[in-house]
Every structure is written in C-alpha cells, then in structure tokens.
Amino acid sequence: CDLPQTHSLGNRRALILLAQMRRISPFSCLKDRHDFEFPQEEFDDKQFQKAQAISVLHEMIQQTFNLFSTKDSSAALDETLLDEFYIELDQQLNDLESCVMQEVGVIESPLMYEDSILAVRKYFQRITLYLTEKKYSSCAWEVVRAEIMRSFSLSINLQKRLKSKE
C-alpha cells in the first residue's frame, strides 16, 4: 500500500502544530519530567510485517487523538491549534485505515498484532495516569506534549522506513 504524498506532509504539519502547542518554558518543568517508557521495540526494525507496522502506527495516532480530544486538553491547550491537529490526525487515520484494509485484508485479524497494540495502549495509559496524578497542571501538559512530539517523530521514522522498503 502506498501512503499518499499528502500523508508525509500531514505528519510534518502535525509535528509543527505540536511544537506550537507549547505554552510554558520546559526549563521551569524539570521537576515534573517523566519517563513514560515508550515501547521502542515496537518501532524498531525487527522482522516487522508491513501490516503489523501499519496497525501499530494506526493505534499510536488513534491514542494520540484520544489523548488530545479530552476536555482537559481543550482547557490546557490552544483550541485553534487543537482543531487543526485533529484534522491532521483524522486524515492520517483515514490513510492508514485504507492501508490496513489493503495489507491485512479481511481475512487476517488485527488481533495477530495484539501484543504490539497492547504495548502502545499501555504507554498511553501511563501518560493519562501521569496527567491525572499531576492534576493536569500546565507543566504536566508540557511534559506530555514533549513526549508525544518524540513518539510522533519515531512514528514518522517508522513510516519512512516502510516507504523505503517498498
């Protein structure tokens, strides 16, 4: 499956929007920094089937969408930027969904990749728990924004590797 050219442009736009969402100096948030244990192994060049990689990417973007579409995020972050971010993520999800259908087909079940998808879900659960524990403070949101920027960058790198393997 060939992801459209607009997909990588959308990735770049999403990253720019994430960068623009910064509302507070990270230097004032050093006490709040946190290790969310990003599931790096799910994004490494292991014997990854393309369908598995696409499923993991889809889950990553879906969870990012869920995280940023809560009322707490709307209260903490710029709504205009958030709206633009939702549009980019929605487009990404649509692109990846078409790919999943082509790569996996209806016969193969995404349950085959349950462990990888579960690892991504647990990662986002850790992020949500951290925000709750920190009472959704501005520093907590800044730490999470920085974390999502990095995980998003790693997702983009995986997409680039998939493309170069075609």
Epitope: L15, Q20, R22, L30, R33, R150, S151
Partner: antibody, heavy 123, light 112 residues
Framework: EVQLQQSGGDLVKPGGSLKLSCAAS????????MSWVRQTPDKRLDWVSI????????YYPDSVKGRFTISRDNAKNTLYLQMSSLKSEDTAMYYC????????????????WGQGTSVTVSS | DIVMTQAAFSNPVTLGTSASISCRSS???????????LYWYLQKPGQSPQLLIY???NLASGVPDRFSSSGSGIDFTLRISRVEAEDVGAYYC?????????FGSGTKLEIK
C-alpha cells in the same frame, strides 16, 4: 551526516560585543533544542545558554545573564550567540551543541558539538 | 548550583587493561522519575567533546561497549574495560538534573 559549523570568534576589547554563529546541516534543525558551551583556558567546560527548538524559550546561568543572548533562525538553520559587555573571564573556546530528543524525560544530553570558535577578551 | 567534582588525572593505565574515572556531585542526581541525570563526555586532544554516556548508564550511539558507567546518585564511575590508545583525552562528567547544567573539571586519562 550531522554537522555544526561555527564562526564569529575574534579578539575583542573588554566591554565590547561579538556575535557567534552556528550553521546546522544533516538534521531537522527546527526539531532540536540547542546550547552554547564554552571551554575556558584552564580546559573547564562551562554551560552558557540553551534555547528550545522553536526559539520561544531560553535560559542563562547568572554568569552571563543580561549580557549574552541566544537566538536561532530556523529558516536559515542557524544558531546565534550575541555577547555584549564582554569581560576577560569570557575568554574561551565557544561550542554550539545539539540536544538529543528527550521526550517527556527532558534529556538534555548534547549529542553533537560544533568544532568551536575562539573568543579572546583582552585590551 | 550543583557542583561536579573530578580528579585532574586518572591513575596511569597500561593499554589493554581497565581504567576507572570517578565523579562526585554535591547533590543526588536521581530524579523522582527514576532517571539519574548524569552524563559523561570525552574530549580527545584537538577535538570537540563527544557524548559517551547519558542518564548515568546508557551508551551513546557509536560508543564501543568497552565503556560502562554506574553510580549511586552522588558517586559515579566510568569504566573502560580494555583501554586503547584512542581513548586518551579528558573525561568530563555533567549533570542535567537542574539548571544551570554543570560539568566536572575533567579527568585526563594517563597511559603508562
């Protein structure tokens, strides 16, 4: 290949000003935080300033606060250090350095360094 | 400010043997998130510093596994298991726990 090419070092009189540049290539400059670190004649490393990827936030130690200004032009992939009211103790080799992508744990490891540019403050 | 203390010189070592370089911080560098924000940099003669170790014990990209690092939060040790001629230089420890970020004064690795 990541490269940080520095320029602007010079001999300057006490009280004078100087602007250092650091041209970045081989990576997406606008995605990385950057710092300036200096090495004094006795070979000590002294961290001078830091700037976020977008350039909105900066931080300086007390030794240079109010005299030095770090800035960046992401369109030109260049980092700057404007130094004014220079003192003899500012004499050093100045290095620009890129910060590793840290995510939520804010790892400010300096994973790539420029070749350095020499600043001498003397009358 | 957090003060990082290092000896100016290491004990002279023979090529092929192991070497240890120590560093001490004036405050624990162990963050409540479980990460120890201690770093090691090597500056070879005539070169810029290069990152060796991040977060106390993680090897930076391209660094040979002859290098390892451990510590308690305050006392840290960098170990080189089989010293090679190219390991000569000044080793600096640094902390990124708090601003301002600070470096040790550097330890020169001496070869017998």
């Amino acid at each position: 290949e990541v490269q940080l090419q520095q320029s602007g070092g010079d001999l300057v009189k006490p009280g004078g000003s100087l602007k250092l540049s650091c041209a970045a290539s081989g990576f997406t400059f606008s995605s990385y935080g950057m710092s300036w670190v200096r090495q004094t004649p006795d070979k000590r490393l002294d961290w001078v300033s830091i700037i976020t990827s977008g350039g909105s936030y900066t931080y300086y130690p007390d030794s240079v606060k109010g005299r030095f200004t770090i800035s960046r032009d992401n369109a030109k992939n260049t980092l700057y250090l404007q130094m004014s009211s220079l003192k003899s103790e500012d004499t050093a080799m100045y290095y620009c350095a890129r910060h590793a992508e840290g995510g939520g744990n804010y790892d400010y490891a300096m994973d790539y360094w420029g070749q350095g540019t020499s600043v001498t403050v003397s009358s | 400010d957090i003060v990082m203390t290092q000896a100016a010189f290491s004990n002279p070592v023979t090529l092929g043997t192991s070497a240890s370089i120590s560093c001490r911080s004036s405050k624990s560098l162990l963050h409540s998130n479980g990460i120890t924000y201690l770093y090691w940099y090597l500056q070879k003669p005539g070169q810029s510093p290069q990152l060796l170790i991040y977060q106390m014990s993680n090897l930076a990209s391209g660094v040979p596994d002859r290098f390892s690092s451990s510590g308690s939060g305050i006392d840290f040790t960098l170990r080189i298991s089989r010293v090679e001629a190219e390991d000569v230089g000044a080793y600096y420890c640094a902390q990124n726990l708090e601003l301002p970020f600070t470096f040790g004064s550097g330890t020169k690795l001496e070869i017998k």
